[in-house]
Amino acid sequence: IIDGAPCARGSHPWQVALLSGNQLHCGGVLVNERWVLTAAHCKMNEYTVHLGSDTLGDRRAQRIKASKSFRHPGYSTQTHVNDLMLVKLNSQARLSSMVKKVRLPSRCEPPGTTCTVSGWGTTTSPDVTFPSDLMCVDVKLISPQDCTKVYKDLLENSMLCAGIPDSKKNACNGDSGGPLVCRGTLQGLVSWGTFPCGQPNDPGVYTQVCKFTKWINDTMKKHR
């Protein structure tokens, strides 16, 4: 997260980290006791999922292995359209005050809505500095028309843009798959942005979760 600050303790109990061994790979969100939602470009063969602590490496955190993941069938490595994936935990997460399910959206929030993006990704770019504590930054939703003015052909349907004019505030490497939460519901998953991160007037681009609630529910049902 660029130009952010540590999240208020316990304010993001649905936030998870996907680790490769002990190394941060991506962010994600807990949908229920068995399922984590993240970005399709985060796919690996096996995951270790960190839950229940804002601090990576915290011994009190739950760590659960996951071996099965299901990318959206329309995901494209070239355009990053449909950049979402469900990861099935090998064992159930234990819900608590620090481990809660995210609220999936019942509607798409409009441009101008203030939202929070969070993650353990690098706080500097291009040189990397990975924090141990979960970082947050507030950004505003940007209309597809305004975002297309910046990204032109790179922007596809079901991509959601967010940022602050003339500001560096944005997600970065390591935040991928993590949540963009607006008015208490999950509206976006960190998908992509320009590199180096934090270019003023280059919005962050997110998978627009409100367009995929049916796929999320159908996929979890299908692979129960």
Epitope: H41, T77, H80, P126, V150, Y151, K152, D153, L154, A171, C172, N173, S176, S191, W192, G193, T194, F195, P196, C197, Q199, P200, N201, D202
Partner: antibody, heavy 122, light 107 residues
């Protein structure tokens, strides 16, 4: 189809400044997510990255050349330029301009100019 | 800077042969590794991006694999038009750096 075309003198005297321009057609230099690079190749050798410029004017140069390099952009002309000062014979090379799709998830050079040979000699 | 070590520096193979080139990064670059083909007097051309993704319009006999520090580029069945020099390039970190190249010739 994006096309890039380098232009500038093919012969530069030692200690002078090498100046090249890259003209972009078929795409806007102001498009977000695309960075505009200079890369060179010494005769019979490999590729050396020089630096880039973004639509905002943000630049990044190879530390090995940083003290001598300036890259600038003219969005109104859809052009970007390279200046390399205090040249020596070691700067004799084919100079390429290139576009990179440069995202957090994916970054690569997708379009290149055909290259222009610059010889440094008195 | 991240050093990219490419091997072999040159190879000679027959038409139809399987050709493999390796590239090793001096530190972890995840999958930010691209492969380019350069024919004499021409600019490099992108073949593979992000370690394993085939660029649009590139024949399927070209493939790439690997992650972290070790990467492989393969031509499954060498064709006469594949005579060229091949370069790997890391895009994980600035400055971007290239391997030394592998010159592929026909026996």
């Amino acid at each position: 189809q994006v096309q890039l075309q380098e232009s500038g003198p093919g012969l530069v005297k030692p200690s002078q400044t090498l100046s090249l321009t890259c003209t972009v057609s078929g795409g806007s230099i102001s498009s977000g997510g695309y960075y505009w690079h200079w890369i060179r190749q010494h005769p019979g050798k490999g590729l050396e990255w020089i630096g880039y410029i973004y639509r905002s004017g943000y630049t990044y140069y190879n530390p090995s050349l940083k003290s001598r390099v300036t890259i600038s952009v003219d969005t109104s002309k859809n052009q970007f330029s390279l200046k390399l000062s205090s040249v020596t014979a070691a700067d004799t090379a084919v100079y390429y301009c290139a576009r990179a799709k440069q995202l957090t998830t994916s970054r690569y050079f997708d379009y290149w100019g055909q290259g222009t040979l610059v010889t440094v000699s008195s | 800077d991240i050093q990219m070590t490419q091997s072999p520096s040159s190879l000679s193979a027959s038409v139809g042969d399987r050709v493999t080139i390796t590239c090793q990064a001096s530190q972890d670059i995840a999958n930010y590794l691209n492969w380019y083909q350069q024919k004499p007097g021409k600019a490099p051309k992108l073949l593979i991006y992000d370690a394993s993704n085939l660029e649009t319009g590139v024949p399927s006999r070209f493939s790439g694999s690997g992650s972290g520090t070790d990467f492989t580029f393969t031509i499954s069945s060498l064709q006469p038009e594949d005579i060229a020099t091949y370069y790997c390039q890391q895009a994980s970190d600035l400055p971007f750096t290239f391997g030394g190249g592998t010159k592929v010739e026909i026996k």
